[in-house]
Each structure stands twice: as structure tokens, then as C-alpha cells.
């Protein structure tokens, strides 16, 4: 089966994995976008969205993710602080539009984390749990419960990349607290 | 099988104008971002300007900045570089490169196309 | 604008031997570093992305490491193929992305 186009980041425990994602600011600026992991099988999962209205560059925080939605440049910016192992898999970014099924934005993200440091001596290794501090008014937002089956059979683009590492489970520290309210009727 | 071909490259005196064309086949070309490349004689890469995969951002080089505007075509699947009022150190071989879907970096990368500006 | 540093400029290396090319970044950019492989005549080919990950199809003699300023690309077995000319990139957040001026990988 094709597959949607995938990008492979592979990381060491401890590390922070950064991707940005790119919308049509015209638009989605304003938009609430989430974070989602794609489990096989399974409606993918929201982990995190930016508030409702989105908010220009104003950081969300739930448990080790960050979100950063950058309106005047279309881009939203996540980051996992503090890799596990247990956070690989497949994550995506979506924008919710609607009633409108969400939005997918190019690629799914395929993480995969392994125990230990590759650094080299005099490599700041740390620094990515250190360099980003996110002040005490980040706030979490409401993450819609909404997910439309169809965002995991739609027709998928040509793939580019096909990455076969399995999916592996995920348990993301702190995550728990998202409260999901079901805001779209 | 992702392919980057540009054209439009030549000789062009000092003041004058020239456009770059890479014609892109192989991927969803409206969900990525764009760039171009230079890289001067004898010398190293430098990035001259990006633009968002729905062209409604764009990004420039200093160096360029107010006579190179980017461009792109999605129905045709085509990048634009109109480069106007070009000067002697404009003179490189010009490279049209994907952006990966992830972050601002160059997967895939076109051979290139040179552009000599001297009178 | 962050000013992306390389060393050495020239890296003379037997065939077999193991190649160690360093890059270092004015500011901190976390593990957003790209490395690049171009050969005379031809286009650059990406090699490895957010410092650690290697593109599609390279092989894996070729590693990355580092986070913050400090980067290193490194060969393990250097092949005929490999002497080319290497650059390091950012990719932080926002264009302009600067690239190392270089690392020449040459026949010792």
C-alpha cells in the first residue's frame, strides 16, 4: 500500500526532537493546530494543540511538547524535550478547520529513540533540555476530541520516503493532564 | 524519483535581469518549501531564498534582498528566481533545492544552472 | 545571523582511515544541523539531517554528533568515493539558514 510521505528522525534518549510545520498563513494563521501520534490502526491521537484562537508565537506547553504557531511566517514549530524511548512512533501535524475534517501538514514524522547519548567529547548533549525554558504562564489549551476516521484511510500523496521502522508504543510523561473537551458539534 | 531540472542560466552584463526556472517532478510539489542555492566559483554554498510551499511566505538573502523575487507555479509545478539589477558577484552556478517537509533543510538539490554577469 | 564555522579547511586522509570534520555554530542551534557531501562538477547530496539522522541511502560509515555549537561529521572508513568537499548548515528556525564554508576531504 502507498503510504503517506514520512520523515525519519532518529534520536538519542534526552535529546529534543524540533520539526516545524508549514501552513498557507493566509489561511490557517489564526487556526488551531494540534500534535498528533499516528498508532496503526487507530484515528490519530491529539497530544497537544495551540489555543483556540491560535495565538502568535505565544508557546504551549503539555508535559514535554511545545507548540509555537508563528502566524506572520506560517509555521508551527513542536518540540519533545526530553526524548524516551517509549516516544517513538508517527506523529503528524494537523490544523482544525471546521466542521471540516483537519487539516494534515507535510510529513508525518517517524521518531525513533534509543537509549544512550552519541555525543561528542565537548558536545553540549544537555543543552536541549536546558535551552529552551518556557515561562510559568505557558498555557495548556483545550484540545478538540474531534478526529475524522478519514484523516487515516484518505488517499495518500506519492510517497517520497518509505520508512519501515514498526511503531512503537508511546507513553508520554505529563500528558495525561490534557482535558479534552469535545468543542465542535 | 524526486527531480529538480533548472534553466534559464547565461550571460548577463552588470544592471540587467535574468529569471531561473526549475521545473519539479516526483514529489507533491504544493506541500514543500523551495529554495535556491548559489555557489560563487571556486567558493562555498550560499542560501539566497526560500519560498513556503503555498508561496505565501517568502525569505531573502540580505544580498539580494530588493532584486531577486522568488516565485512558484503549483498547477505547473514550477520555481521562478527574477533576478534584476544583477552585479558582478551575482555570477554563480544556481541551484533549485527542495525543503524537506520537517525543517528548512535541502533533501533533494536540481545539477544546477550558471549565471555570469560581466560586461 | 548565526555564522556557521568549519574545521579543518583541508582534511588530508588515507584511503580506510577515519575522517573527523567539525563544525561549530555561533549560537546555540540545538541538534538543527544539516551535513552535505558535494564532489567538483556536481550538485551537493545531503547526508544527514538534525545532526544525528542520515538521509535516505547513505551509508553508514557516515555519522553525526553534537548538540548546541559543536558538531562533528564523522567517516569511519574513508571509501574513493568520499574525498569531496563537506558543509555544515543550520536550520534553527527562520531563513536566512547559513551553511560552514567548507571541509575539503582530500587523498593523503
Known amino acids: 500500500a502507498t503510504k503517506l510521505t514520512e520523515e525519519k528522525y532518529e534520536l538519542k534518549e534526552g535529546q529534543t526532537l524540533d520539526v516545524k510545520c508549514d501552513y498557507t498563513l493566509e489561511k490557517f494563521a489564526s487556526s488551531q493546530k494540534a500534535w498528533q501520534i499516528i498508532r496503526d490502526g487507530e484515528m490519530p491521537k491529539t497530544l497537544a494543540c495551540t489555543e483556540r484562537p491560535s495565538k502568535n508565537s505565544h508557546p504551549v506547553q503539555v508535559g514535554r511538547i511545545i507548540l509555537e504557531d508563528y502566524h506572520d511566517h506560517g509555521l508551527l514549530r513542536v518540540r519533545m524535550v526530553n526524548l524516551q524511548v517509549e516516544d517513538s512512533g508517527l506523529y503528524q501535524c494537523v490544523i482544525y478547520q471546521p466542521p471540516k475534517e483537519p487539516h494534515m501538514l507535510f510529513d508525518r514524522i517517524r521518531l525513533v529513540v534509543t537509549k544512550g547519548f552519541s555525543g561528542t567529547p565537548g558536545s553540549n548533549e544537555n543543552s536541549t533540555q536546558n535551552v529552551y525554558k518556557i515561562p510559568p504562564t505557558t498555557t495548556k489549551a483545550l484540545c478538540p476530541l474531534y478526529t475524522s476516521p478519514r484523516t487515516v484511510t484518505q488517499a495518500p500523496p506519492k510517497s517520497t520516503a518509505d520508512v519501515s521502522t514498526p511503531d512503537s508504543e508511546i507513553n508520554l510523561t505529563n500528558v495525561t493532564d490534557i482535558i479534552r473537551v469535545p468543542v465542535f458539534n | 524519483e524526486v527531480q529538480l531540472l533548472e534553466s534559464g542560466g547565461g550571460l548577463v552584463q552588470p544592471g540587467g535581469s535574468l529569471r531561473l526556472s526549475c521545473a519539479a517532478s516526483?514529489?507533491?510539489?504544493?506541500?514543500?518549501?523551495m529554495s535556491w542555492v548559489r555557489q560563487a566559483p571556486g567558493k562555498g554554498l550560499e542560501w539566497v531564498s526560500t519560498i513556503s510551499g503555498s508561496g505565501s511566505t517568502t525569505y531573502y538573502a540580505d544580498s539580494v534582498k530588493g532584486r531577486f523575487t522568488i516565485s512558484r507555479d503549483n498547477s505547473k509545478n514550477t520555481l521562478d528566481l527574477q533576478m534584476n539589477s544583477l552585479r558582478a558577484e551575482d555570477t554563480a552556478v544556481y541551484y533549485c533545492a527542495k525543503v524537506a517537509g520537517s525543517n528548512f533543510f535541502f533533501d533533494h538539490w536540481g545539477q544546477g544552472t550558471l549565471v555570469t554577469v560581466s560586461s | 545571523e548565526i555564522v556557521m564555522t568549519q574545521s579543518p579547511a583541508t582534511l588530508s586522509v588515507s584511503p580506510g582511515e577515519r575522517a573527523t570534520l567539525s563544525c561549530r555554530a555561533s549560537q546555540s542551534i540545538n541538534a538543527n544541523l544539516a551535513w552535505y557531501q558535494q564532489k567538483p562538477g556536481q550538485a551537493p547530496r545531503l547526508l544527514i539531517y538534525?545532526?544525528?539522522t542520515r538521509a535516505t541511502g547513505i551509508p553508514d560509515r557516515f555519522s553525526g554528533s553534537g548538540s548546541g555549537t559543536e558538531f562533528t561529521l564523522t567517516i569511519s572508513s574513508l571509501q574513493s568515493e568520499d574525498f569531496a568537499v563537506y558543509y555544515c548548515?543550520?536550520?534553527?528556525?527562520?531563513?536566512?539558514?547559513?551553511f560552514g564554508q567548507g571541509t575539503k576531504v582530500e587523498i593523503k
Open positions: 538534525g545532526a544525528y
Open positions: 548548515q543550520e536550520f534553527i528556525l527562520f531563513p536566512p539558514h547559513t
Open positions: 516526483g514529489f507533491t510539489f504544493n506541500a514543500y518549501a
